[in-house]
Interface confidence: medium
Amino acid sequence: YPYDVPDYAGGGGSGGGGSMMTGTIETTGNISAEKGGSIILQCHLSSTTAQVTQVNWEQQDQLLAICNADLGWHISPSFKDRVAPGPGLGLTLQSLTVNDTGEYFCIYHTYPDGAYTGRIFLEVLESSVAEHGARFQIP
């Protein structure tokens, strides 16, 4: 979606309320992939009836992408050549390099619960023996 800002510096945070945060985030956990290949990052929020207003995908403190309930997807300009939205609320990383190794976070901004965060660790391997973690399916 064509947001009218030049880039993102990170950040998140969303609606929340006085209610208990009962939800849980399921993620793909620790995954590995080959250099030059692609990988799907998936999270799933369960055990809450909270409304998801926005999902942010972050790598350390860099914002990769946003999926907003009203506006749809926005990919940060510095990642737009290598990041594709989906499937679902997930994120596809392409043309992987060893520098892509590290922590990735899905942040579900919900009302009235607040922000839920899931963590994925991606290791990008040089060799072809990289074992991909089991594909995570959103029901």
Epitope: A9, G13, G17, N56, D61, L63, H74, P112, T117
Partner: antibody, heavy 119, light 107 residues
């Protein structure tokens, strides 16, 4: 240049109504969530209401819930706050503020409009 | 609701001083804290968001740190235009709440 200009404030009796407006320019209004925040004379800031870019998410502070209604007209680049059943404690400067695209902090604010509720 | 407590409520300092303002949340808000500056008769201005990220156009003498419940705004070398009231705001949960403010006055 981002500009937010509030209007519609004034003196009103307890139990009365007012409609505040916020005219936005210098950015794509329809892409941004918007807030109303108020500040009673000599006091701190109090968040009042929020509306998302497409009006699918609307939230209110408990102190105004059921009395105030936030709305927007993206075609007119305008934000509104309909205030009913006004009380003396609603006396404040009311600011409209733009929400950053990536989270719920307010990156641009209007100059404010004063609402005085008094008999 | 999350209560935000700022300290001190006011302080006196001189131009060139290093000034530190703290903000404590009544429960964890991760990194989701913003800092605003407000001058008399004016609207607030966003300085810092997401705990430590400097808003575009804000001088680098302003910095933010902290996560969880304890946060700090630091002005490394106070300038004449920095005398104002500073507010913290949590943006982790509805309803979004502000601290009571810290007034920075000229010594």
């Amino acid at each position: 240049e981002v500009q937010l200009v509030e209007s519609g404030g004034g003196l009103v009796q307890p139990g009365g109504s007012l409609r505040l407006s916020c005219a936005a320019s210098g950015f794509t209004f329809s892409n941004f969530g918007m807030h109303w925040v108020r500040q009673a004379p000599g006091k701190g800031l109090e968040w009042v209401a929020f509306i998302s870019s497409g009006s699918s998410s609307i939230y209110y502070a408990d102190t105004v819930k059921g009395r105030f209604t936030i709305s927007r007209d993206n075609a007119k680049n305008s934000l509104y706050l309909q205030m009913n059943s006004l009380r003396a404690e609603d006396t404040a400067v009311y600011y409209c503020a733009r929400m950053r695209l990536d989270y719920y902090a307010m990156d641009y604010w209007g100059q404010g409009t004063m609402v005085t509720v008094s008999s | 609701d999350i209560q935000m407590t700022q300290s001190p409520s006011s302080l006196s300092a001189s131009v060139g001083d290093r000034v530190t303002i703290t903000c404590r949340a009544s429960k964890s808000i991760s990194k989701y804290l913003a800092w605003y500056q407000q001058k008399p008769g004016k609207a607030p201005k966003l300085l810092i968001y997401s705990g430590s990220t400097l808003q575009s156009g804000v001088p680098s003498r302003f910095s933010g740190s902290g996560s969880g419940t304890d946060f700090t705004l630091t002005i490394s070398s106070l300038q004449p235009e920095d005398f104002a009231t500073y507010y913290c705001q949590q943006h982790n949960e509805y309803p979004w709440t502000f601290g009571g403010g810290t007034k920075v006055e000229i010594k």
